[in-house]
Amino acid sequence: GKQMTQNYSKMSAEGNISQPVLMDTNANLCCPPIEFRNLIVIVWEIIIRGQPSCTKAYRKETNETKETNCTDKRITWVSTPDQNSDLQIHPVAITHDGYYRCIMATPDGNFHRGYHLQVLVTPEVTLFQSRNRTAVCKAVAGKPAAQISWIPAGDCAPTEHEYWGNGTVTVESMCHWGDHNASTVTCHVSHLTGNKSLYIKLNSGLRTSGSPALDLL
């Protein structure tokens, strides 16, 4: 799988990091840079909606680890915590959306680093002609919802969003070019995982162009 790097993350004023990560890749989350000799305890708190809070704790003095309410085997210490305090999610699933916080307890207080993990799912993009000079562009099961735009602009129905139980969204846009002399129209789909453009000759076949998904990672 593709390893997520932190180039794509954003730090908030409170020291929390907004961390988008692509589904089916591996994610590594890091603790604050505290000298190991100053540590008393390292704890990862994992808060996923609809589940009890999971804590993974390591006590340096006794070299002991303890877990509370942690059932997901895909979320583990990268190594033994005395070697590496990072948390690994391998592979990332859509259910891993949540808040992950490393707390490093020292004699001088606690030091925190939190991640708002947003799992990204690349939408499947399709474009087809439904009837005379009318085209439908669909971005199926993306997370978050994709945005669809058209070149040239047509006479478009309101964009429809279909929300699935797993958090993905299908976006559908239908446009008509009745009075327009355009022979080819392009559907441009913007998404955090990458952009994609498909074009179609009205009353004709389908062509694709543009950036493949994942270009932006």
Partner: antibody, heavy 124, light 107 residues
């Protein structure tokens, strides 16, 4: 029932070392838990000083620096406080206490058993 | 370190009354606050931890509330044995710190 009892000299001269003993009954200190020293100054201000854990590792309040040492004698089921270079500001009632059982190693830092305390005056 | 400010320093009440003692932390300590009762020559008693959890053996007339920086210990229907010195202690982070104490006296 776990019981703790502090003992030691009630009077110490400035610049000397203060040495106190905490004797524990009802539990073996090497079996578990952390064991702490806390003091209460005249005027009732309380200060956590440090602990020794069941494995013998220690953690001290940073502001006490190199003046403090907590050790133990496992054969006597006792742990000790030594505070060097004392001054009249170290006059206090000294308590030993046992940490509550850890549920998660973090945030569980409070005390479920205490000794009655021993008063120490630092004066020439 | 986290400064703990306790108020009032002295409280006078009669048996049967209800009283409240306040504790304010200088930073967010979430729910991690303990309350103790202290009497001369006796071991301190842990009453409440994690803000509102009663320690085993603590009578139900004691209750704790609060989150973040502001906490309260409430004693309802005071009994004669409730008079003494009360302390709060934050157990969120090291170094552990205590409030300055509240002396609860009989009116």
């Amino acid at each position: 029932e776990i019981q703790l009892q502090e003992s030691g000299p009630g009077l110490v001269k400035p610049s000397q070392s203060l040495s106190l003993t905490c004797s524990v009954t009802g539990y073996t200190i090497t079996s578990g838990y952390d064991w702490s020293w806390i003091r209460k100054f005249p005027g009732n201000k309380m200060e956590w000083m440090g602990y020794i854990n069941y494995g013998g590792s220690t953690n001290y309040k940073p502001s006490l620096g190199s003046r403090i040492s907590i050790t133990r004698d496992t054969s006597k089921n006792q742990f000790f406080l030594q505070l060097n270079s004392v001054s009249p500001e170290d006059t206090a009632t000294y308590y030993c206490a046992k940490y509550n059982e850890y549920k998660s190693y973090i945030y569980d830092w409070y005390f479920d058993f205490w000794g009655p305390g021993t008063m120490v005056t630092v004066s020439s | 370190e986290v400064q703990m400010t306790q108020s009032p320093s002295t409280l006078t009440a009669s048996p049967g009354e209800s009283v409240s003692i306040n504790c304010k932390a200088s930073k967010n300590i979430r729910s991690y606050l303990a309350w103790y009762q202290q009497k001369p020559g006796k071991p301190n008693k842990l009453l409440i931890y994690s803000g509102s959890t009663l320690h085993s053996g603590t009578p139900s007339r004691f209750s704790g509330s609060g989150f973040g920086t502001d906490f309260t210990l409430t004693i309802r229907n005071l009994e004669p044995e409730d008079f003494g010195l009360y302390y709060c202690q934050q157990h969120h982070e090291y170094p552990l710190t205590f409030g300055s104490g509240t002396k609860l006296e009989i009116k």
